[in-house]
């Protein structure tokens, strides 16, 4: 019997498309699973077959390519919907095969509805703009391959529900939207609607993305440790709980990994025998600057623990810093009857 290499359901590719719009979906086999492309496969005599499984059942069926107006068609390794319908939602399978070879993968496709203000369950890509950084652009995404370069589509941009025209610092320029100087007030969802003709029909492509204005690299600084600092001394008696917060401010930096960690006597807490716990919390400013707090806690501190060196470290793409906490053992208050009496020369 025939074996088929089944890559299962590729949930990494959660494809979402809008109802009543064209959609072109590439077979993921050639992008993620196989080491050759469609052209090579085709010239080697392999055939690409498409199936789908309806949203509410488990049995796959061949895709019907004989629908009116060729609503669903295949071109090379691309499955085309012109346009989609709500009940096209389901799991799609592309299978590459000949008499001796077979490989297949399934992926989910969700056809979603949008309202007149482009609100929908669609997961939106986020585009970050630097605050007050000069001209920056966003581009209408995922429209390549829908129409030939000879076709000149019309593109309309919206912020939320409102068509962008005569905005102070936002200018539509075809497929691009330019921000002359990005401000916090530019945060929001931006939608481009691309309209193009094909075979006497008019199609619309709707693409929404979220713009988030973030801290500018011009203002970025290395991590700043606010705590521990030289003004606070952690003075404890043995048996008490020792709590030392390490609070670090990180400027927003694109793709930077912000790290905070404690060392005790130069070692990571995991590498030493004392019973220490560390709890972390993270907060963000409106421009995505980050404040991380790691609280080091020793439930019942010993006099040995109070002699150790506790250092908070922080690192970002801008640099690395460290700060030691001032920890000392509290000197017990003198007991009057004995110590003070002795001090006054009582016999």
């Amino acid at each position: 019997s025939e074996r088929c290499d089944d890559w299962g359901l590729d949930t990494m590719r959660q494809i979402q498309v809008f109802e009543d719009e064209p959609a072109r979906i590439k077979c993921p086999l050639f992008e993620h699973f196989l080491k050759f492309n469609y052209s090579t496969a085709h010239s080697a005599g392999l055939t690409l077959i498409w199936y789908w499984t309806r949203q509410d059942r488990d049995l796959e069926e061949p895709i019907n390519f004989r629908l009116p107006e060729n609503r669903i068609s295949k071109e090379k390794d691309v499955l085309w919907f012109r346009p989609t319908l709500l009940n096209d939602t389901g799991n799609y399978t592309c299978m590459l095969r000949n008499t001796t070879y077979c490989s297949k993968v399934a992926f989910p496709l969700e056809v979603v509805q949008k309202d007149s203000c482009f609100n929908s369950p669609m997961k939106l890509p986020v585009h970050k703009l630097y605050i007050e950084y000069g001209i920056q652009r966003i581009t209408c995404p995922n429209v390549d391959g829908y129409f030939p370069s000879s076709v000149k589509p019309t593109i309309t941009w919206y912020m939320g529900c409102y068509k962008i025209q005569n905005f102070n610092n936002v200018i539509p320029e075809g497929m691009n939207l330019s921000f002359l100087i990005a401000l916090i007030s530019n945060n929001g969802n931006y939608t481009c609607v691309v309209t193009y003709p094909e075979n006497g029909r008019t199609f619309h492509l709707t693409r929404t993305l979220t713009v988030k204005v973030v801290g500018s690299p011009k203002n970025a600084v290395p991590p700043v440790i606010h705590s521990p600092n030289d003004h606070v001394v952690y003075e404890k008696e043995p048996g008490e709980e020792l709590l030392i917060p390490c609070t670090v401010y990180f400027s927003f930096l694109m793709d930077s990994r912000n790290e905070v960690w404690w060392t005790i006597d130069g070692k990571k807490p995991d590498d030493i025998t004392i019973d220490v716990t560390i709890n972390e919390s993270i907060s963000h400013s409106r421009t995505e600057d980050e404040t991380r707090t790691q609280i080091l806690s020793i439930k019942k501190v010993t006099s040995e623990d109070l002699k150790r060196s506790y250092v908070c470290h922080a690192r970002s793409a801008k640099g690395e810093v460290a700060k030691a906490a001032k920890v000392k053992q509290k000197v017990p208050a003198p007991r009057y009857t004995v110590e003070l009496a002795c001090g006054f020369g009582a016999t």
Epitope: C4, I49, Y51, D56, R57, L59, E60, E61, P62, C102
Partner: antibody, heavy 116, light 111 residues
């Protein structure tokens, strides 16, 4: 057309493979099913092999029955046969039309007799 | 697994008369209409009569009709002919294909 073969008299516990040979049917475009009928009894669903090769068995058939296919045949492999498995085994095309599946084309069946 | 329960056998019908056979599913069939009816004569494979609860299969006389939705279905044979003497089976398709099932069959005797 569909033609089943491989049915014969076997003793309990003997494995047996039945073959459904198809002609004029592209098995990459159709689901195929196996159904059996004990003498004087009703039809009983065994399972389906989907057009892309996915498998769907009746709960009672899981583990003992295995469906597979090549470009021109659909096989039913049976293990641990008992006298209860004595039946005529049919293969049927499980076709979808307007989103509705049905068994639209049947073979003549092949008789399996399990007897000590 | 789904269970399909048919009218107890046998059912008698006079030539020229009408006979109805019922089929009840323990759960709703897929799309509320994925139910088929088959005719089987001794020594022959089943023959498809109706699919989609009410769609007449190609080449089947219009004397046969199907109705129903969800879990309750009926096959009706009007102007019964002697050639209609056979056993009739319903078959259901479900969201989970493993639940597919056939009814126990109803024998129609023509007098």
């Amino acid at each position: 057309s569909l033609e089943e073969s491989g049915g014969r008299l076997v003793t309990p516990g003997t494995p047996l493979t039945l073959t459904c040979t198809v002609s004029g049917i592209d098995l990459s475009s159709y689901a195929m099913s196996w159904v059996r009928q004990a003498p004087g009894k009703g039809l009983e669903y065994i399972g389906v092999i989907g057009s892309s090769g996915n498998l769907y068995y009746a709960s009672w058939a899981k583990g003992r029955f295995t469906i597979s296919k090549t470009s021109t045949t659909v096989d039913l492999k049976m293990t641990s046969l008992t006298t209860e498995d004595t039946a005529t085994y049919f293969c049927a095309r499980y076709t979808i039309d307007s989103g509705i599946y049905t068994y639209d084309l049947w073979g003549q069946g092949t008789l399996v007799t399990v007897s000590a | 697994a789904a269970v399909l329960t048919q009218t107890p056998s046998p059912v008698s019908a006079a030539v020229g008369g009408t006979v109805s056979i019922s089929c009840q599913s323990s759960q709703s069939v897929y799309g509320n209409n994925e139910l088929s009816w088959f005719q089987q004569k001794p020594g022959q494979p089943p023959k498809l009569l109706i699919y989609g609860a009410s769609i007449l299969a190609s080449g089947v006389p219009s004397r046969f009709s199907g109705s129903g939705s969800g879990t309750e279905f009926t096959l009706t044979i009007s102007d019964v002919q002697s050639d209609d003497a056979a056993t009739y089976y319903c078959a259901g398709g479900y969201s989970s294909t493993s639940d597919n099932a056939f009814g126990g069959g109803t024998e129609v005797v023509v007098k």
